[in-house]
Amino acid sequence: KFSKQSWGLENEALIVRCPRQGKPSYTVDWYYSQTNKSIPTQERNRVFASGQLLKFLPAAVADSGIYTCIVRSPTFNRTGYANVTIYKKQSDCNVPDYLMYSTVSGSEKNSKIYCPTIDLYNWTAPLEWFKNCQALQGSRYRAHKSFLVIDNVMTEDAGDYTCKFIHNENGANYSVTATRSFTVKDEQGFSLFPVIGAPAQNEIKEVEIGKNANLTCSACFGKGTQFLAAVLWQLNGTKITDFGEPRIQQEEGQNQSFSNGLACLDMVLRIADVKEEDLLLQYDCLALNLHGLRRHTVRLSRKNPIDHHS
């Protein structure tokens, strides 16, 4: 619960925060968990503790391991763990998954890519940005404070973005890089009057008495995320839950399935052990959103079992 993963590259600076929080006046002690050895606070050490922070200046592969921080408060000690992994630098351009920070999404209106963990470091602008290892150049790219802004975002802008900056500690400079994926989402969404794809209006569905039957109500409501959209079944104009027949249940199928970019919903009506009286009912597939409600009616008819006797 009170553990956080941190990672970095050898010969780069890595600063790790204690997962436990406290007041500025609380002291924080750091230990290397495997040896229970205290981490020094003197800045002349390559690895040293500075309050809530543990600093590797620079990091080495051998530094990998679990570090314990203890925040000493008046009433109890709060213990946290930092799971640190230092990786060797890759010779090729490819950034492996284990070095990637969380993916961010952008759109035409909002295309900020924040440089991960940068707030931990003592850095000065400008940040350097790379996409798939290529330095970003051109007026579309603007490094602003701790983030990159891309003007007129296009789907081709998706990819892995690396920020590079210099951490300064007592006059010494250390390089830091961090990479995250950027995906582009289409914000050109719209909403329209529901279109029921199945069943067809006044469809007759053949069923076998004594067998199970499934009816699917499928409708599309526009493109992109929909504010309000629902599909449901009614029996003789009554909601399934109110109809009171336990053999007949509805369950959601694929939720917000984007086929051809359209936002669609499915609702499956399951009829167990079909009975004669089920053939007398009117089954309504209803699709509704802010534009209104559309209804397609289905009736069941008996399907004669194939006679295998000669």
């Epitope: 619960k1 925060r17 929080q21 007041k23 500025p24 006046s25 008046p74 707030d119």
Partner: antibody, heavy 116, light 113 residues
Framework: QIQLAQSGPELKKPGETVKISCKAS????????MNWVKQAPGKDLKWMGW????????TYGDNFKGRFAFSLETSASTVYLQINNLKNEDTATYFC?????????WGQGTLVTVSA | DIVMTQSPPSLSVSVGEKVTMSCKSS????????????LAWYQQKPGQPPKLLIY???TRESGVPDRFTGSGSGTDFTLTISSVQAEDLAVYYC?????????FGGGTKLEIK
Amino acid sequence: QIQLAQSGPELKKPGETVKISCKASGYTFINYGMNWVKQAPGKDLKWMGWINTYIGEPTYGDNFKGRFAFSLETSASTVYLQINNLKNEDTATYFCAREGDGFAYWGQGTLVTVSA
Amino acid sequence: DIVMTQSPPSLSVSVGEKVTMSCKSSQSLLYSGNQNNYLAWYQQKPGQPPKLLIYGASTRESGVPDRFTGSGSGTDFTLTISSVQAEDLAVYYCQNDHSYPYTFGGGTKLEIK
């Protein structure tokens, strides 16, 4: 400058749910925990608990366990207070306050009124 | 829970007068680990959030006028306003900043004659 901006006033009926927000700006959000404080009309201040903004771990005061939930959206530097099954006695102004030696930074407060 | 008791509940003074208010805690707020007293004082004006005046029992928050002074240790604490100004009209709260649950006193309402 450091600011905590809270969502607007809420009028709710008993039994309903309310979720109020507190958006932090001007500092590194995950460096400091966030407290919630309740003040009923004309009454004194009651500490409700706090949330660790780095790992999302909430701590609740004894009188605020069960119906109350703290949560956060780190990417938006925002913490939330949700109160379920509202009661008349939940009518109060709710403040967020940044953890520190004393609470130096407070939101402007969100008035929640519970009335049938 | 630590109980914070403030006195007096209210007081009325003239501009320029010196005023002191008391706050007592049911347990010591001194942390031997760093010799800090975890007590804070706040000023709250109508319709506003509380404003931190003093933390650590005696450290004045940045921007707070030097007429406000906090003192005391352990369980007994005092807030002194050396020369009350009209804008000091408010309710003053002390707070246990030592251990959960953080608790506030009932407040001292300062009125100007």
